[in-house]
């Protein structure tokens, strides 16, 4: 057993033209965090395949807001080490994947938005217990500087953390302070004992009696934060020389709090407030099991049967995140079809459908022929998955619900006057023409070319008074029809509005629930 440790020194635009000015999008401020993934062997594995050796997520870095006209600074990074514990032997050869993620803090519907900014993959050989290895990697226009190492946790020792070093009660041939290591009884090994007083948070040692400082800390016991930074060279976290170190304004700067714990300064020290499921001086101990209820919003916890095992959360609809803590705007997936309005009520999605559509997702078109949606005697004509209405005389529109003006097309020929009527239209023909549409000329001798057709009306015709009477009746009928239509429409609208108010009231109640 042991721990793989990764220290991110810097992440920012690489040298050269075309380097990005800011990691944030135009939508506003953002902050960075890192994910490390370890896979055994040197094979080029897909980033999506399991991180068989383990994975870790850093805390969120400070909020970064781009300053207009200002040069792109070093980006503020999350504090502290990323630690990936491994339970079995350290494989020696491994793939290291480091992802830089951006969390946008603008006005996102449903909370912050995450996007992958850069991913670097390295295939490496590394012995456990060795010094920090340093690296610079490019990912597109970005540059990442980091150091890493693998160390065993007692009683495991050795380059693969496979040998167990146990104190023995029997006298041994080892010298003072040394102890025999199984399986070789005559092999003695001392875990490195750091210099007395060496900071547990900011220092470490590879040889007994030394105290080597992490990035941002200096002094014989690594207690002194470095106050200035002029450059960032390739020195690793074991560097104790001045320069090329990240500034550290206080005891919380090195982020001694692991697992997303928040650090607060106390006189001469710090205090960690740990998130749910973590405890210890630096929130380094996870005692979470499913019985602790680590999944928020009713999420289902799987695993965690024993205190050492991890758990995963299976989230309810509308939530995501490792602990189901992040709300998803399910309406962003546009589940409502045919222009329906989406409402995320938290415990359910509701689609408010446009007129003519129904169903949980407004997927049913009420205006199909099966619904006989053609009004006023219209005939439904289907074809190619769509439908249309062939309307009766005097009606139009998609569903034949609109009154059509039969005179709009000017059906009366030769200057005939058109009058609309419930049963259709009537043409009053100009002198010299006759027929239903005034389409036939009358012969000069007064004999029609088509004697079977009823003659049109001419001035001085004895039937003229009768026609005028008909026209007056038609006009009165039209006015009466319009009045009836307006009244019935108002009644319908009042009924619809009443139903809509009731529906909105119900939705308001559900949203409040």
């Amino acid at each position: 057993a042991g721990v793989f440790e990764l220290q991110i020194h810097s992440f920012g635009p690489g040298p050269g033209p075309g380097a990005p000015r800011s990691p944030c999008s135009a939508r506003g401020p953002c902050r960075l965090f890192f994910r490390v993934c370890l896979k055994p062997g040197l094979s080029e594995e897909a980033a999506e395949s399991p991180c068989a050796l383990g994975a870790a997520l850093s805390a969120r870095g400070p909020v970064y807001t781009e300053q207009p006209e200002a040069p792109a600074p070093d980006l503020p990074l999350p504090n502290g080490l990323l630690q990936v514990p491994f339970r079995d032997a350290w494989p020696g050869t491994f793939s290291l994947i480091i992802e830089t993620w951006r969390e946008e803090l603008g006005d996102q519907i449903g909370g912050p938005a995450w996007s992958l900014l850069a991913r670097v993959t390295r295939r490496r050989r590394l012995a456990a217990g060795g010094p920090w290895a340093r690296d610079i990697q490019r990912a597109g226009a970005w540059e990442l500087r980091f150091s890493y190492r693998a160390r065993c946790e007692l009683p495991a020792v050795g380059t693969a953390c496979t040998r167990l070093c146990r104190p023995r009660s029997a006298p041994s041939r080892c010298g003072p302070g040394l102890r025999p290591c199984a399986p070789l009884e005559d092999e003695c090994e001392a875990p490195p004992v750091c210099r007395a007083g060496c900071s547990l948070e900011h220092g470490f040692c590879e040889q007994p009696g030394e105290c080597r400082c992490l990035e941002g800390w200096t002094g014989p016991l690594c207690m002194v934060p470095v106050s200035t930074s002029s450059c960032l060279g390739l020195r690793g976290p074991s560097s104790t020389t001045t320069g090329c170190l990240v500034p550290g304004p206080g005891p919380c700067d090195g982020n001694p709090c692991a697992n997303g714990g928040s650090c607060s300064e106390t006189p001469g020290s710090f205090e960690c407030t740990c998130p749910r499921g973590f405890y210890g001086l630096r929130c380094e101990v996870s005692g979470v099991t499913c019985a602790d209820g680590p999944c928020f919003n009713g999420g289902l916890c799987v695993g965690g049967a024993d205190p050492d095992s991890a758990y995963i959360c299976h989230c309810p609809p509308g939530f995501q995140g490792s602990n189901c803590e992040k709300r998803v705007d399910r309406c962003s997936l546009q589940p409502c079809r045919n222009g329906g309005l989406c409402l995320d009520l938290g415990h359910a999605l509701r689609c408010r459908c446009r007129a003519g559509f129904a169903g949980p997702r407004c997927e049913h078109d009420l205006d199909d022929c099966a619904g006989r949606a053609c009004a006023n005697g219209g005939t439904c004509v289907e074809g190619g998955g769509a439908h249309r209405c062939s309307c009766a005389l005097g009606f139009g529109g998609r569903n034949c619900r609109e009154r059509a003006d039969p005179c709009a097309a000017r059906p009366c020929a030769h200057g005939g006057r058109c009058y609309a009527h419930f049963s259709g239209l009537v043409c009053a023909c100009a002198p010299g023409y006759m027929g239903a549409r005034c389409e036939f000329p009358v012969h000069p001798d007064g004999v029609s070319a088509l004697p079977a057709a009823p003659p049109g009306l001419r001035p001085g015709d004895p039937q003229r008074a009768g026609v005028i009477a008909v026209i007056v009746v038609v006009v009165i009928a039209i006015v009466a029809g319009i009045v009836v239509l307006v009244i019935s429409r108002k009644k319908r609208m009042a009924k619809y509005e009443k139903a809509e108010i009731k529906e909105m009231g119900e939705m308001h109640r559900e949203l409040n629930a």
Epitope: A291, D292, G293, G299, L300, H314, P317
Partner: antibody, heavy 117, light 107 residues
Framework: EVQLVESGGGLVKPGGSLRLSCAAS????????MNWVRQAPEKGLEWVGQ??????????HYAESVKGRFTISREDSKNTVYLQMNSLKTEDTAVYYC????????WGQGTTVTVSS | NIVLTQSPATLSLSPGERATLSCKAS??????VSWFQQKPGQSPRLLIY???NRYTGIPARFSGSGSGTDFTLTISSLEPEDFAVYYC?????????FGGGTKVEIK
Amino acid sequence: EVQLVESGGGLVKPGGSLRLSCAASGITFSNFWMNWVRQAPEKGLEWVGQIRLKSDDYATHYAESVKGRFTISREDSKNTVYLQMNSLKTEDTAVYYCTTGYYFDYWGQGTTVTVSS
Amino acid sequence: NIVLTQSPATLSLSPGERATLSCKASENVGTYVSWFQQKPGQSPRLLIYGASNRYTGIPARFSGSGSGTDFTLTISSLEPEDFAVYYCGQFYSFPSTFGGGTKVEIK
């Protein structure tokens, strides 16, 4: 070991009231949504209602069939959730289970409620 | 509310045989379906969540599949302790609803 133990069931006349309790052990009770699910004799399962956490202002939700008659409450300090049943009907006769979470992962052994004249 | 229809109502099989239980939803529920087992006189027990994931401690002979409206619970080789009533439940839309159950009995 996680345990949910229901109690308070019994025989009651139509229109009467009953209060069921569910005592939890082996879990950090205050972190769990709690539900009541019932099962009528020789019938399937029916969700009755749910109470969420203190951080959710102890929000409650109920099935339409019991809305206005049943009330769920919880006492985190006692690791207990309650179901207050008023205006009971014969169709409320069932075994009542308490369960946890959105997905009903842990279940109690149930308590029988019989509504009969 | 979403309606779940389970079939068959009863399945008569012998130990060692394969059991296939069906659950159909009245509308799309994604993969938000769970399966529960209930033995006589006992409370239900969660077997499968998310349509195809075995819950903690559930033997590998139980498997779930499906998405949308059609779901299946398969018991690859029936053990004597598997004879019970199985319910599917949907958790896509609130309130959660259950199917009427399938009784797996010894032939």
